[in-house]
Amino acid sequence: MAVTACQGLGFVVSLIGIAGIIAATCMDQWSTQDLYNNPVTAVFNYQGLWRSCVRESSGFTECRGYFTLLGLPAMLQAVRALMIVGIVLGAIGLLVSIFALKCIRIGSMEDSAKANMTLTSGIMFIVSGLCAIAGVSVFANMLVTNFWMSTANMYTGMGGMVQTVQTRYTFGAALFVGWVAGGLTLIGGVMMCIACRGLAPEETNYKAVSYHASGHSVAYKPGGFKASTGFGSNTKNKKIYDGGARTEDEVQSYPSKHDYV
């Protein structure tokens, strides 16, 4: 019961985590910036992994996608890659874990197979969570270092003059969503791995069996298997306990040369 609960909870936590990673990846508020020196109106800039937006105090909002793939900073490309890998691994992990859930019966799937699938999905969730945390942390580091806005400088560009205005970017909501989501996915993965240990079948322990001859006509074969030509009803060598067989729980047995334990 505890194993089923741990597995189920791990699945739900991971599901929430992966949904959060997807949300964070799609969000535009990875970095935010307020412009207080705007002579016209309060303008609020924010950027995501895919596009840049501006929102005015009037409520007007405009977003534009990043114009090129090759011109983007390597760090931004790395963050995108980490987040996408995290989502893909998480999605596969969810798919695997659905079939691994103990409460869901699919055909004659053995517990050992479910245990392996639970472990696989758990590892996938852990890696997915780590990818998300790493991606968000790399982006946060980019904002903290703020390498492209260290000074305000003016230079002549094509067709006129360009001035880089010193600006400060702060952490956007998506970073916090990503950190929390990555953490949840990681925790869910750990829970799945813990559940896997409980699902894995122990070594099969047969109860000790004592055999007592009930009559002279009964022939015993070593190993407790009934003699078979291969054409009878016992082709799979199933253990046969006849009338004389009793488990040690049922009768007190005494040693004899016919005892096989």
Partner: nanobody
Framework: EVQLVESGGGLVQPGGSLRLSCAAS????????MGWYRQAPGKERELVAT???????NYQGNLKGRFIISGDNTKDTVYLQMNNLQPEDTAVYYC???????????????WGQGTQVTVSS
Amino acid sequence: EVQLVESGGGLVQPGGSLRLSCAASGNILSINYMGWYRQAPGKERELVATITRGGSTNYQGNLKGRFIISGDNTKDTVYLQMNNLQPEDTAVYYCYFRINFGILGGLRDYWGQGTQVTVSS
């Protein structure tokens, strides 16, 4: 790179009108606002008018009423309709864009090369 191309300047008689236009092209992301500055001979550059993408406008005090700023968001173009021009309006008019590149390069102010407006009889 962002390029600003201005047009519409020229010689006009006092009381006349001119319409300046400025089109931005290139890798443009979030335009915070666009507008016009002017610089008369021997004077400092001064703000004429600015407009945000949402249409909020700001004019230099005594110009409101005579000058009308407008923008076309789809074309990334800003216009300045100048009416009842006076000799003191003679200056080089510079188109202006403030563009936010965010994580790709911060906040940048762009000025065009300028277009000459001369008000004379």
